[in-house]
């Protein structure tokens, strides 16, 4: 799965007034081989202003922004659609401190995936959003190749195959 | 194999680059590390390239030293030098382990000389 | 920066004996060391990783141990040939950034 397909998520603000920010995904292939058309229009759509985020049952709040921890396992991709389905998306980390409270709250030791991958086009790691990752901020472990994507482990950043199955975190 | 080369005799303050060629290695895979060494002292770390083309620095590197790659060589520049930069420059590939780093196999070195 | 403290910075034995090299680290790098020989003339060479686990050909007369900040290197049954001088580096890294300093290395002499 290329996030590169299209932009996932443009909210400005934490709002989502204007259709025209907007870009579709187009179809996401999924392991199984159905398709689904899933609009950036729709993961906005239940998010409210940053300071006023009200989180769903079962979803953390932290800085604005609410965060699920599942407790099943799946590959990167069926993780990616399981957030967009739910409206919401992988888990993006901006900073050192949003790093600081996933560690927090992850309770196991195993890997854990979260919303960045390699993309052979851009040869970049690139978060569902679409923007590239910052090396001065974060430092991944491991190839960076086709079929890389990215899951966290205690305070560290790892390169696996997309196709492992592991938990995933859910934000919006 | 990792192979240095370009090391020679410089004049304070010039720039020089020196050159790892790396063979049978992908770099998407390893990461390659400089590491230094004056005459008569201990090792010392510069910085590495990861496997998606960032470069990393010791604190004391930063701002002078500059790695880069190309497919099959990553590149060492050197600006400012001193006679303190004299050492010979190690390239050196880690082992690809999935969660620990550490460096398995070294070139020879290539000496420079301020 | 984490930095490395080795010590001590020469150490003489006779063939045959032990010989232990210490490390200490200025912060907590779990178990994330290894060790190095290095002999004149030559690039180093790995010895231990992982702070305990020996590298693939490397005799079991090297032994490495600790965890946190303090780190040992054991050498017994020592050999003329293990005289070299031994470094070990950190290997820590966190989601922000790797810290791979050397200790200032152990001159290791056999009688």
């Known amino acids: 799965l290329l996030v590169s397909q299209g932009v996932l998520l443009k909210c400005q603000k934490g709002s989502c007034s204007n259709a025209t920010q907007y870009e579709d995904t187009g179809d996401l292939k999924v392991n199984n081989g159905t398709r689904r058309n899933i609009s950036n229009k729709d993961l906005c759509a239940s998010r409210s202003a940053d300071q006023t985020v009200l989180c769903q049952s079962e979803w953390l709040k932290y800085q604005g922004k609410c965060y699920w921890f599942s407790n099943e396992m799946k590959s990167w991709s069926d993780s990616y659609v399981y957030c967009l389905e739910r409206k919401s998306h992988l888990l993006i980390i901006h900073d050192q401190l949003e790093m600081a409270f996933i560690q927090k709250n992850l309770r196991q030791l195993n890997y854990v995936w979260i919303g960045l991958n390699f993309t052979s086009l851009k040869m970049t790691w690139t978060w569902v959003d679409g923007s590239p990752i910052d090396s001065k901020i974060f430092f991944i472990k491991g190839p960076a190749k086709e079929n890389s994507c990215a899951a966290i482990k205690e305070s560290k950043i790892f390169s696996e195959t997309c196709s492992s199955v592991f938990k995933w975190i859910c934000q919006y | 194999s990792l192979e240095e080369s370009g090391g020679r005799l410089v004049k304070p303050d010039e720039t020089l680059t020196i050159t790892c060629t790396v063979s049978?290695?992908?770099?998407?895979?390893?990461?390659i590390s400089w590491v230094r060494q004056a005459p008569g002292e201990g090792l010392e770390y510069i910085g590495f390239i990861n496997t998606d083309g960032s470069a990393y620095y010791a604190t004391w590197a930063k701002g002078r030293f500059t790695i880069s790659r190309t497919s099959a060589t990553v590149d060492l520049k050197m600006t400012s030098l001193t006679t303190e930069d004299t050492a010979t420059y190690f390239c050196?590939?880690?082992?690809?382990?999935?969660?620990?780093?550490?460096?398995?196999?070294w070139g020879q070195g290539t000496l420079v000389t301020v | 920066d984490i930095v490395m403290t080795q010590t001590p910075a020469s150490v003489s034995a006779a063939a045959g004996g032990t010989v232990t090299i210490n490390c200490q680290a200025s912060q907590s790098i779990s178990n994330e060391l290894s060790w190095y020989q290095q002999k004149s003339g030559q690039p180093p060479k790995l010895l231990i990783y992982g702070a305990s686990n020996l590298e693939s050909g490397v005799p079991s007369r090297f032994k490495g141990s600790g965890s946190g900040t303090d780190f040992t290197l054991t050498i017994s049954d020592l050999e003329c040939a293990d005289g070299a001088t031994y470094y070990c580096q950190s290997n820590y890294y966190d989601s922000s950034s790797p810290d791979f300093a050397f200790g200032g290395g152990t001159e290791v002499v056999v009688k």
């Open positions: 050196a590939r880690d082992a690809g382990h999935r969660y620990l780093f550490y460096f398995k196999l």
């Open positions: 049978g290695i992908d770099l998407s895979s390893y990461i």
